[in-house]
Amino acid sequence: TQDTFRGSVLEGVLPGTSVMQVTATDEDDAIYTYNGVVAYSIHSQEPKDPHDLMFTIHRSTGTISVISSGLDREKVPEYTLTIQATDMDGDGSTTTAVAVVEILDANDNAPMFDPQKYEAHVPENAVGHEVQRLTVTDLDAPNSPAWRATYLIMGGDDGDHFTITTHPESNQGILTTRKGLDFEAKNQHTLYVEVTNEAPFVLKLPTSTATIVVHVEDVNEAPVF
């Protein structure tokens, strides 16, 4: 049986939130006697911050839950719980295990465009042309789902001419042409782009929007019969 368990829970969760389950096995009979009935308890918590009762364990299932508010990833990113499993339903032999609880960064910061307005120039008929890179800042953990940006063109792209992807390292939004633009048909497009995260927000946060004015540049085209 494993004697070190690892689990995780988001910072700031409400008391009652389940974290993980630990299990101890006992070969003794648990049907006709209590010899094989295991009872779980938390013997100690380290660190004891903000206080020493941040977690509780279900006596019979071994499910560890948050019992107090105040989990703060910046302050304490990992807790060590010493778990006791005692057979005879709590009156017999005891064994100990360790549960390491990682406190995860909650998505409590929205990505924000900086700047919020862009102007770009694109030659007509160019497909796959990089129009503009959009920059966002996010105070959540870098490279985590709470930080990684997801971009969506909310308006202005009636002809489905544009697409936007996220750069995996810089987190910038890369706006490119999906199909060629026609200067003669429309020489300017005003796009509205919204940014969110891969992970859902844990509270109601304002969504940042950027405006991109795309000027289509005329290209001399050969006459057509």
């Epitope: 494993q2 070190t4 690892r6 910046e74 060590t80 990682e102 960064d105 953990a141």
Partner: antibody, heavy 123, light 113 residues
């Protein structure tokens, strides 16, 4: 350039306390946790504890009762205080930076180490 | 606490040879949620501080020569130096960061013939 540097007393009498200061430069203590590790003469490495970016600490349970790690972010300094020293606490004491503040950084791995300060416990 | 056992305690090789050293953990360092092994390798040259070589059991730290390779999963790990150089004379330590307290192996001393 990331720099980590320790300063300590050198010689400590048995039953007395030890205070070591770790001064860092090139990075902020609000972004990186700092670990303390010691190495007795001719022996291996022993992890003592860590102070996280927000000031929380985790200690080696065997030393927890006589160990305190604290810091001053504005001065870029981390402090180790150990009480009731005995001769087997004689060692070189290192402070070492965690790779980052997040689990996915591999924060348990230590990427920058000071040169260490030698502490001898003797009367 | 988790016990880390390294072997051999010392070995002597000639320049250019391939060398492997072992690190065993008293229990698995593989976390199922992210499929990562919480293990690091360090190099400590005589009179110097330890230097991080490998983390996540196999990820080479920036600036570490590619002759150093970490491998393994669960409880059994290996550090390989593909072609030893004279400057590799050092003690090599493994360290687990799966559980507190973090613990180090006893070290493998690499000597050059």
């Amino acid at each position: 350039v990331q720099l980590v540097e320790e300063s300590g007393p050198g010689l400590v009498a048995p039953s007395q306390s030890l205070s070591i200061t770790c001064t860092v430069s090139g990075f902020s203590l609000t972004s990186y946790p700092i670990n303390w590790v010691r190495q007795p003469p001719g022996k291996g490495l022993e992890w003592l504890g860590v102070i996280w970016t927000g000031g929380g600490t985790n200690y080696d349970s065997a030393l927890k009762s006589r160990l305190t790690i604290s810091k001053d972010n504005s001065k870029s300094q981390v402090f180790l205080k150990m009480n009731s020293l005995q001769t087997d606490d004689t060692a070189r004491y290192y402070c070492a930076r965690s790779r980052g503040a997040y689990d996915f950084d591999g924060r348990g791995a230590m990427d920058y180490w000071g040169q260490g300060t030698t502490v001898t416990v003797s009367s | 606490e988790l016990v880390m056992t390294q072997s051999p305690s010392s070995l002597a090789v000639s320049v250019g040879e391939k060398v492997t050293m072992s690190c065993k953990s008293s229990q698995s360092l593989l976390y199922s949620s992210n499929q990562k092994n919480y293990l690091a390798w360090y190099q400590q040259k005589p009179g110097q501080s330890p230097k991080l070589l490998i983390y996540w059991a196999s990820t080479r730290e920036s600036g570490v020569p590619d002759r150093f390779t970490g491998s393994g999963s669960g409880t059994d790990f290996t550090l390989t130096i593909s072609s030893v150089k004279a400057e590799d004379l050092a003690v090599y330590y493994c360290q687990q960061y799966y559980s507190y307290p973090y613990t180090f192996g006893g070290g493998t001393k690499l000597e050059i013939k």
